[in-house]
């Protein structure tokens, strides 16, 4: 018996085609993806093979201004127009906290949403109780498939499920509901799920039971093959795993933002053993047409957003300076906005020994592109924060040794005075560069704030200790020559998009008046510093 | 072999009752979900009730509401339906399904989600 499973992750609110690197798409005939595109094919395949699963391993949530609008709404709406049979929950299903998830999608989805290790307690049991499912028996064709979810244990530092859902061990919380679907002759079983290819690999050598995992989360691209775009790939397509019980275990991902739809056929025996698999994800470009009644509705939804992007979300009493002159220079006020910004947006209070998880911020000079004029009524707009931040990347949360942080902050330096983009705006740190030594040793002073403090204060940067910092994704995947924060990070989870975290920040403080305030020091003759 | 198999349907007058049965064989009605579907000639597949396995809760259908009731004998691995005041539009072909995913018995009857066990189907006809 051959089935079909068609899926996606990480598609992050795009719902509009977008460009080959998944932002903004400008010329419509190179332009990828998207949920018109994204349904002629899976119809396509739908009408030529008879066992076909359309699914989805969360974060569908968050990413454009889809998402800032419409809240989750659009995800419920063109998900179910395309007919998808299952979902699991991804760690951005909780940005708009528990109700943000349950009265947008959970009650309007008209498929499963899946996750076996979150456990609602309190008040909210009752309240969500059947609206998401550990798992999902599925009829397809004359057989029948379980579906069993998982979701990040780092959900509660990456997100706002507050403090009625418990996320467990995933192959602890898996392991049961598997076997139960086994003790009701479920015998084909797929873990769908949210927690990275490395987390994806060990539920499938360590779950009993399961036949096939389907994972996100860590924009894993797999291939076989010539690949067809700019993707590496991490491996073949799909990859095996083999069991600590002696299967072969197939595990897929399709990378992120709806540019490609995973393509995986599996044959099982009458058993409900694997005995083959193969597929690629296919890479869904101009050459697929975009659905017509798809992309009609589309164009309908699209109305509101133009709306929003004009109206005010708060006002500036004081010049946001973003300037290349001052931001690729020394400390400008933009750059301290974007990263207080940051760091609010990261307040998780998860643990009385810390008075937040993180509180420190870096942010490359080069990826502010544009100032903000207080002298227009002070009003701040999408569109304003859009030209300040014209990318569509994302504020992600890694954590990197003090030593790594050092060598950051040394090439921040390494070439001052030419204008280019690496030069480091900081938040939650006090810098002091010397500027007649040689590059690569200029950084003379480094303090950061603690977290595990209840009064907040400034110390010396430890090379040994593990810091968490928020930064963009462009910095965490070694942009602007930043190769050792990519090459030595210990863990990186994607996050918000980045004119949404700023723009919710000035709506919530209404009015802001950013200053330049000392963070960054630099001069350029030789002070008697105690080198650290 | 899985299966689930209708029996109980047939003609009534109005106003009279039937008691439809399901029972199951290749697995235990205890751990599933079960609903009684219902289809009329020319209309869309209804729920009418649904019943959990776990703590028995039930649902019904607005329109059948104080006349039908369902419950399960887990030692027969049987479902009933006891249909009472039958009216002319109650006639159609009866399904009887099962899920042993732990959804809802309302998301069960809605159907919110597609469900994986079916019956053939038992006709019950109600006419003078």
């Known amino acids: 018996w051959e089935l079909t499973i068609l899926h996606t992750n990480d598609v992050h609110s795009r719902l509009e085609q977008t460009s080959e690197d998944s932002s903004k798409c400008v010329n419509a005939s190179r332009c990828m993806g998207g949920v018109a595109r994204l349904f002629t094919k899976v119809q396509q395949i739908r009408r030529a093979e008879p066992n076909v699963l359309l699914l989805d391993a969360g974060d569908q949530y968050q990413g454009t201004i889809w998402f800032t609008v419409y809240k989750g709404a659009e995800v419920a709406h063109f998900m179910n127009a395309l007919r998808y049979d299952a979902m699991a929950l991804g760690n951005h299903e909780f940005d708009n906290g528990v109700e943000g998830l349950i009265e947008p999608l959970l009650k309007e989805a008209k498929f499963p949403i899946l996750s076996a290790n979150i456990k609602a307690k309190g008040p909210l049991a009752s309240q969500i109780s059947g609206l998401y499912l550990p798992y999902k028996v599925l009829p397809v064709g004359d057989e029948v498939v379980g579906i069993v979810g998982y979701t990040s244990k780092e959900t509660p530092f990456l997100s706002n499920p507050g403090t009625n859902l418990v996320f467990e061990d995933e192959i602890t919380a898996l392991q049961p509901e598997v076997d139960k679907l086994k003790t009701l002759n479920v015998n084909k079983i797929i873990a769908l799920g949210h927690s990275g290819f490395e987390m994806d690999k060990l539920i499938a050598q360590k779950v009993r039971g399961v036949d096939v995992v389907v994972g996100g989360h860590s924009n894993t691209f797999l291939y076989t093959g010539n690949p067809p775009s700019k993707e590496v790939p991490a491996g073949k397509y799909p990859f095996i795993v083999t069991s600590d019980d002696g299967r072969k275990v197939p595990v897929v991902q399709a990378y992120a933002f709806g540019k490609y739809l995973g393509y995986l056929k599996i044959e099982f025996d009458e058993r409900g053993n694997v005995i083959s698999s193969h597929g690629n994800p296919i890479l869904l470009n101009s050459s697929i047409p975009e659905d017509p009644s798809i992309k009609a509705d589309i164009n309908k939804w699209r109305i509101k957003l133009d709306n929003y992007s004009t109206q005010e979300l708060g006002k500036t009493i004081v010049y946001l300076d973003g300037s290349s002159q001052s931001c690729r220079f020394r400390e400008c006020n933009m750059g301290n906005l974007i990263c207080d910004a940051m760091i609010n947006n990261n307040l998780r209070h998860t643990d009385e020994m810390f008075w937040n998880h993180v509180s420190m911020c870096i942010l490359n000079g080069g990826g502010i592109r544009s100032p903000i004029d207080e002298r227009n009524n002070g009003t701040i707009t999408w569109e304003n924060l859009a030209a300040v931040l014209p990318f569509g990347g994302t504020f992600d949360l890694v954590q990197l040794k003090g030593s790594t942080l050092k060598k950051a902050f040394e090439h921040s330096v390494h070439r001052y005075g030419q204008s280019t983009g690496e030069f480091l705006q900081v938040g939650g740190i006090h810098v002091v560069y010397d500027l007649s030594r040689k590059p690569g040793d200029r950084v003379v002073k480094l303090d950061v704030l603690c977290t595990k403090c209840r009064v907040p204060s400034y110390d010396p940067l430890k090379m040994d200790e593990v810091y968490k910092v928020i930064l963009p994704n462009f910095l965490a995947n070694g942009g602007d020559g930043f190769q050792m924060i990519k090459d030595e990070l210990l863990r990186h989870d994607s996050g918000d998009q980045d004119i949404n975290v700023v723009s919710t920040y000035i709506s919530k403080m209404k009015v802001i008046y950013p200053a330049v305030e000392g963070r960054i020091k630099a001069h350029h003759h030789h002070h008697h510093h105690h080198h650290h | 072999q899985r299966q689930l198999v209708e029996s109980g349907g047939g003609l009534v007058q109005p106003g009279g009752s039937l008691r439809l049965s399901c029972a199951a064989s290749g697995f235990l009605l205890d751990y599933y979900v079960i609903g009684w579907f219902r289809q009329a000639p020319g209309k869309e597949r209804e729920g009418v009730s649904c019943?959990?396995?776990?703590?028995?809760?039930?649902y019904y259908a607005d329109s059948v509401k104080g006349r039908f009731t369902i419950s399960r004998d887990n030692s027969k691995n049987t479902v009933y339906l006891q249909m009472g005041s039958l009216r002319a539009e109650d006639t159609a072909v009866y399904y009887c399904a099962a899920d042993p995913s732990p959804v809802t018995v309302q998301a069960m009857c809605l159907p919110r989600f597609p469900v994986p066990y079916w019956g053939q189907g038992t006709l019950v006809t109600v006419s003078s």
């Open positions: 019943i959990s396995g776990s703590d028995r809760s039930t």
